[in-house]
């Protein structure tokens, strides 16, 4: 999906009001020094591409993020504020139902959510290169 035509400001508002708080709840008890951000993004569409990938695609050691509250709210925000996003997700959702696993918070998941916080931070404030 090409995130170029999303309403970035509306997504940002949704992130600040709810999604960010759910991410903090998920990470509660984790030291702020524990994880270094290794995934980066260069502009808002790129950030949303990386956010979608880390939130919804199962990875080795962390297969369960898609059912978390922050993930459901992320999906809703993208569906509302990115034209045509919902249609592209129907097949992905059906595939997800088939491979649903028991919800377990692993250290790998905590690291992944820490990366998500970093991606959202850069989505909110892409550091523009000096002219």
């Amino acid at each position: 999906y090409d995130f170029t035509n999303c309403d970035f400001e509306k997504i940002k508002a949704a992130y600040l009001s709810t999604i960010s708080k759910d991410l903090i709840t998920y990470m509660s008890g984790t030291k702020s020094t524990e994880f270094n951000n290794t995934v980066s993004c260069s502009n808002r569409p790129h950030c949303l591409t990386e956010i979608q990938s880390l939130t919804f695609n199962p990875t080795a050691g962390c297969a369960s993020l898609a059912k978390e509250m922050f993930a459901m709210k992320t999906k809703a925000a993208l569906a509302i504020w990115c034209p045509g996003y919902s249609e592209t997700q129907i097949n992905a959702t059906q595939a997800m139902k088939k491979r649903r696993k028991r919800k377990v918070t692993t250290n790998k998941c905590l690291e992944q959510v820490s990366q998500l916080q970093g991606l959202w931070r850069r989505f909110n404030r892409p550091l523009l290169k000096q002219q």
């Epitope: 940002k12 992130y15 600040l16 702020s32 994880f35 951000n37 959202w120 909110n124 404030r125 000096q130």
Partner: antibody, heavy 119, light 107 residues
Framework: QVQLVQSGAEVKKPGASVKVSCKAS????????IEWVRQAPGQGLEWMGI????????YYAQKFQGRVTLTADKSTSTAYMELSSLRSEDSAVYYC????????????WGQGTTLTVSS | DIQMTQSPSSLSASVGDRVTITCRAS??????LVWYQQKPGKAPQLLIY???NLQSGVPSRFSGSGSGTQFTLTISSLQPEDFATYYC?????????FGTGTKLEIK
């Protein structure tokens, strides 16, 4: 807990340079942008520039471009602000600040470094 | 660059009063606005981010509203520790700029 500790007060002559340090602790230094803000006596806050400690990317306010240099030392979790060709109008308190978890504000500030420029 | 204008520049009020400070942006900044409180000789402290979100640990008597170019900070019932200078700042794009400040004094 998160802390930004700045270097001590400086007295400089016009035309000289100053380098202020900002040592960060209590968080992953390279994950967050560091910004520099100054405040002249009795005046408001003035944004100077920003650095990404991970990449070294910087952005300076037009007013300071060519005179200010922001750097970061990942090994010591320290950010630096160097201001050259000092003039009396540069007398101010200089603050470093860390962006928040959401990137929508500054949530922690240094205690400030007072710079006096006088002949 | 985006200019931020605050009004009033100073304000006298009494403990228990409801106070409103306004910040105007020279162009649309959506909800990308922050409010800080600063006391003499101290660094600013974050009150509100994203125009309306209360920073953790900040008393609920502080609230923010507005979007686009017009924003307000409201203190519902002034407490003695609220007498300070308040600044808005846009977080829309680089370069960031601060408002001119509002000094809140005891009447």
């Amino acid at each position: 807990q998160v802390q930004l500790v700045q270097s001590g007060a400086e007295v400089k002559k016009p035309g000289a340079s100053v380098k202020v340090s900002c040592k960060a602790s209590g968080y992953a230094f390279t994950n967050y942008l560091i910004e520099w803000v100054r405040q002249a006596p009795g005046q408001g806050l003035e944004w100077m520039g920003i650095i990404n400690p991970e990449s070294g990317d910087t952005y300076y306010a037009q007013k300071f471009q060519g005179r200010v240099t922001l750097t970061a030392d990942k090994s010591t979790s320290t950010a630096y602000m160097e201001l050259s060709s000092l003039r009396s109008e540069d007398s101010a308190v200089y603050y470093c600040a860390k962006e928040s978890l959401t990137g929508s504000s500054y949530d922690y500030w240094g205690q400030g470094t007072t710079l006096t420029v006088s002949s | 660059d985006i200019q931020m204008t605050q009004s009033p520049s100073s304000l006298s009020a009494s403990v228990g009063d409801r106070v409103t400070i306004t910040c105007r942006a020279s162009e649309n900044i959506y909800s990308n606005l922050v409010w800080y409180q600063q006391k003499p000789g101290k660094a600013p402290q974050l009150l509100i981010y994203g125009a309306r979100n209360l920073q953790s640990g900040v008393p609920s008597r502080f609230s923010g509203s507005g979007s686009g170019t017009q924003f307000t900070l409201t203190i519902s019932s002034l407490q003695p520790e609220d007498f300070a200078t308040y600044y808005c700042q846009h977080f829309y794009e680089t370069p960031l700029t601060f408002g001119t400040g509002t000094k809140l004094e005891i009447k």
